[in-house]
């Protein structure tokens, strides 16, 4: 299962941690994807390490753990964020976070 804070808020210009917690007795995590709406933000796997899309690379820092730290937030960053855990042999698990960026 995926456990996450469904709604989080942060101030414009500040930073926020996007975090999903995956727990399973049997499935192994093979890759984690982060998306902003439909746009791929970052991926992680042991074969690859962390990779962040170039359009976000100046503001998105991998971690902590399998989460992302989003910096220098703007009002345009308000919206839905999705984590996808690809696991073996358990399949795909998804989490959703709604980020509200508030004026400072």
């Amino acid at each position: 299962t995926i456990d996450t804070k469904r709604n989080i808020s942060a101030e414009e210009g500040g930073s926020v941690i996007l975090q999903c917690h995956f727990s399973s007795d049997t499935a192994e995590v093979t890759q984690v994807d982060w998306k902003q709406q439909d746009q791929l933000l970052a991926i992680y796997s042991v074969d690859l390490g962390w990779h962040v899309a170039s359009v976000f690379s100046d503001r998105v820092v991998p971690g902590p753990s399998l989460g992302l730290t989003f910096q220098s937030l703007t009002m345009n960053d308000t919206g839905e964020y999705f984590c996808t855990y690809h696991t073996y042999p358990g399949g795909i698990y998804k989490g959703r976070i709604f980020l509200k960026v508030q004026e400072s």
Partner: antibody, heavy 122, light 107 residues
Framework: QVQLVQSGAEVKKPGSSVKVSCKAS????????ISWVRQAPGQGLEWMGV????????NYAQKFQGRVTVTADESTSTAYMELSSLRSEDTAVYYC???????????????WGQGTTVTVSS | DIQMTQSPSSLSASVGDRVTITCRAS??????LNWYQQKPGKAPKLLIY???SLQSGVPSRFSGSGSGTDFTLTISSLQPEDFATYYC?????????FGGGTKVEIK
């Protein structure tokens, strides 16, 4: 059926650079990453680095950091590995290998290029 | 980096023999282990992923087992085409690392 076709053998002088190409024939890089692995004569396999073509970003083994650059051209489905400041110890066969992204990420390196022999000699 | 140690480094066996190769990780890697086969002058070939899952097209005489730090590749009945070098590879901690290889030779 995707095949990875690598460029031909190279002979290089110490201190120079080499650039090896790896073209995906019969497929694209859309859902894949490309790893680079080398094998010195009579030795084992050594992982060098990996690129995710959809991002154009690469990660490298600490040993090769600063000396290796991996790039990809999505339009031609070709990945490149450039190794600089060559020394005799870099004489090896260099392989590219495909990694799945997403749901099949657990597969590991399931398609390999035929290998490119790089000889470093003065 | 995680160190992968294979044993033996080489072995001699006959066609029809049961062959077992072991791979030990310097720390627990759960079941994040692959096995590859390499023949002289050829690229490696993926045999087993996730410690025990057989790659498509690989004969069922190959099997993998183990989790944590200790893993085994077994060839139930060695065939002439199986004489090769076998490598384990961990994919639990970045960067991925390989074992030193086990060469299976004809007795």
């Amino acid at each position: 059926q995707v095949q990875l076709v690598q460029s031909g053998a190279e002979v290089k002088k110490p201190g120079s650079s080499v650039k090896v190409s790896c073209k995906a024939s019969g497929g694209t890089f859309q859902n894949y990453a490309i790893s680079w692995v080398r094998q010195a004569p009579g030795q084992g396999l050594e992982w060098m680095g990996v690129i995710v073509p959809i991002f154009g970003t690469a990660n490298y083994a600490q040993k090769f950091q600063g000396r290796v650059t991996v790039t990809a051209d999505e339009s031609t489905s070709t990945a490149y590995m450039e190794l600089s400041s060559l020394r005799s110890e870099d004489t090896a066969v260099y392989y590219c290998a495909r990694l799945h992204l997403g749901q099949k990420a657990y597969y590991g390196m399931d398609v390999w290029g035929q290998g490119t022999t790089v000889t470093v000699s003065s | 980096d995680i160190q992968m140690t294979q044993s033996p480094s080489s072995l001699s066996a006959s066609v029809g023999d049961r062959v077992t190769i072991t791979c030990r990780a310097s720390q627990s890697i759960s079941s994040y282990l692959n096995w590859y086969q390499q023949k002289p002058g050829k690229a490696p070939k993926l045999l087993i992923y996730a410690a025990s899952s057989l790659q498509s097209g690989v004969p069922s005489r190959f099997s993998g087992s183990g989790s944590g730090t200790d893993f085994t590749l077994t060839i139930s009945s060695l065939q002439p085409e199986d004489f090769a070098t076998y490598y384990c590879q961990q994919r639990y901690v970045f960067p991925p690392t390989f074992g030193g290889g086990t060469k299976v030779e004809i007795k």
